[in-house]
């Protein structure tokens, strides 16, 4: 049987890579219920001083980073990545998630979301990875795989509650977030709401509810008055800069 | 409109093997969770496995456990169901269901899966 | 794993009679986005299960309005104001709250 333990995340793109080995082993919590959280051999960590934040893709950064190595070129080629400040309006990228929220990467450069820059009927091609993380499958089953989705993105944009692939599915105010085994458009976080903050790769744990990003103007921070707290139940919250 | 179409099922002697698929339409499929259900001969209801919408996360019913693998083609827009070392009780109608249940018929017709030696 | 448990098993029923069925679940199928995962199928003999009503109250598209449900947290039940021939099968009820799905072990409806 498995056991319940609440998480939320606000790591809102696609799941982040589950922490590695965890599925089935001795020792390992492996928990599937409202919220859940398994443990490997990685701790929580929250550290509150800004180190690099090691990554494989976009996805494992925060909302206002992109995934790249810090030298120019082809990013991650025999490489650390890390995760890196979004690229404002007006400048050069190579994909969306380079842009800072409210922006998408058109011919080369950063430019002004419009909520409707992609044309109705207009294909987008996104690699998703899919790290294999079966948990107490078959041996065998657990390699790697690139999977090409191809989706096609129209003008309405989904509404609470609807299901998404990606944010700019979903209307203003809204990200697509996981819920259960899928993705809907849940809300944006406003000040004083609860968010989580991944600061360290492997400190993802296997999020079956994702919640938002922080809005514009809030970061995600320490709550003050839980300062004093244990590194594990320091509490996080939308704070403004 | 939303269809979970469910196919792969037949008789099959103990200790084989046998892939079960289920072909969706009509929705975002690689947005959604999907599960397998089944139901064996006069029996209630039981739960086998699930997937996450992009295939990274799977869980299954520890009668299952080791022996079944949940896998999916978000391209092809298609559940599959890998049943390795089947035994008598893994008899049953297997039903794909799809996640959050609310906005669409969630369950497929079924495939019958007989295991007799 | 949850459990879910229904009663009565069985209920023969006389046309146009009210008639319900309870569910109750080992623990709290609420959720913290103020959700309850709490489903009720219907499954006539040689037919899949078919969804009557879901987040509690909720009558998914097609079902008549002679099908109700109502409660909260544990305790869940199913009414059928008027018992209409169509209405013989199995009754099931359902949490989604976390995996594995469990389902109560069905009440058979049938006419007098």
């Known amino acids: 049987t498995l056991n319940s333990v609440l998480i939320n995340s606000n790591a809102i793109k696609n799941l982040p890579p589950p922490l590695g080995g965890a599925g089935g082993q001795p020792g390992s919590a492996v928990s599937v219920a409202p919220g859940v959280l398994y443990e490997g051999g990685n701790k929580y960590q929250t550290l509150d001083n800004y180190q690099p934040y090691p990554c494989a893709e976009d996805e494992e950064c925060g909302s206002d980073e992109y995934c790249s190595s810090p030298s120019r070129g082809a990013a991650g080629v025999g490489g650390v990545q890390i995760c890196l400040a979004c690229r404002k309006r007006r400048k050069r990228c190579m994909r969306h998630a380079m842009c800072c929220p409210g922006n998408y990467c058109k011919n080369g450069i950063c430019m002004p979301s419009d909520h409707s820059h992609f044309p109705r009927g207009e294909i987008e091609e996104s690699i998703i990875e899919n790290l294999g993380n079966d948990h107490n499958a078959a041996a065998g089953d657990g390699y790697p795989r690139r999977t090409t989705l191809t989706s096609k993105i129209y003008h309405t944009k989904g509404q609470e509650g609807s299901v998404c692939l990606r944010s700019s599915d979903c209307a203003a105010g809204l990200c697509c977030a996981r819920h259960f085994w899928s993705k809907i458009c849940k809300p944006v976080l406003k000040e004083g709401q609860v968010c989580t903050k991944h600061k360290r790769k492997g400190s993802h744990g296997l999020e079956i509810f994702q919640r938002c990003y922080c809005g514009e103007g809030l970061a995600c921070r320490i709550q003050k008055d839980h300062h004093q707290a244990s590194n594990s139940s320091r509490l996080h919250t939308c704070q403004r800069h | 409109q939303v269809q979970l179409v469910e196919s792969g099922g037949g008789v099959v002697q103990p200790g084989r093997s046998l892939r079960l698929s289920c072909a969706a339409s009509?929705?975002?499929?690689?947005?959604?969770?999907m599960h397998w259900v089944r139901q064996a001969p006069g029996k209630g209801l039981g739960w086998v496995a699930v997937?996450?919408?992009?295939?990274?996360?799977?869980y299954y019913a520890d009668s299952v456990k080791g022996r079944f693998t949940i896998s999916r083609d978000n391209s092809k827009n298609t559940l599959y169901l890998q049943m390795n070392s089947l035994r008598a009780e893994d008899t049953a109608v297997y039903y794909c269901?799809?996640?959050?249940?609310?906005?669409?018929?969630?369950w497929g017709q079924g495939t019958t899966v007989t295991v007799s030696s | 794993d949850i459990v879910m448990t229904q009663s009565p098993l069985s209920l023969s029923v006389t046309p146009g009679q009210p008639a319900s069925i309870s569910c109750k679940s080992s623990q709290s199928l609420l959720h913290s986005d103020g959700k309850t995962y709490l489903y009720w199928y219907l499954q006539k003999p040689g037919q899949p299960p078919q969804l009557l009503i879901y987040e509690v109250s909720n009558r998914f598209s097609g079902v008549p309005d002679r099908f109700s449900g109502s409660g909260s947290g544990t305790d869940f039940t199913l009414k059928i104001s008027r018992v209409e021939a169509e209405d013989v099968g199995v009754y099931y009820c359902m949490q989604s709250i976390q995996v594995p799905w469990t389902f109560g072990q069905g009440t058979k409806v049938e006419i007098k």
């Open positions: 997937i996450s919408y992009d295939g990274s996360d799977k």
């Open positions: 009509g929705f975002t499929f690689s947005s959604y969770g």
């Open positions: 269901a799809r996640d959050l249940v609310d906005t669409a018929m969630p």
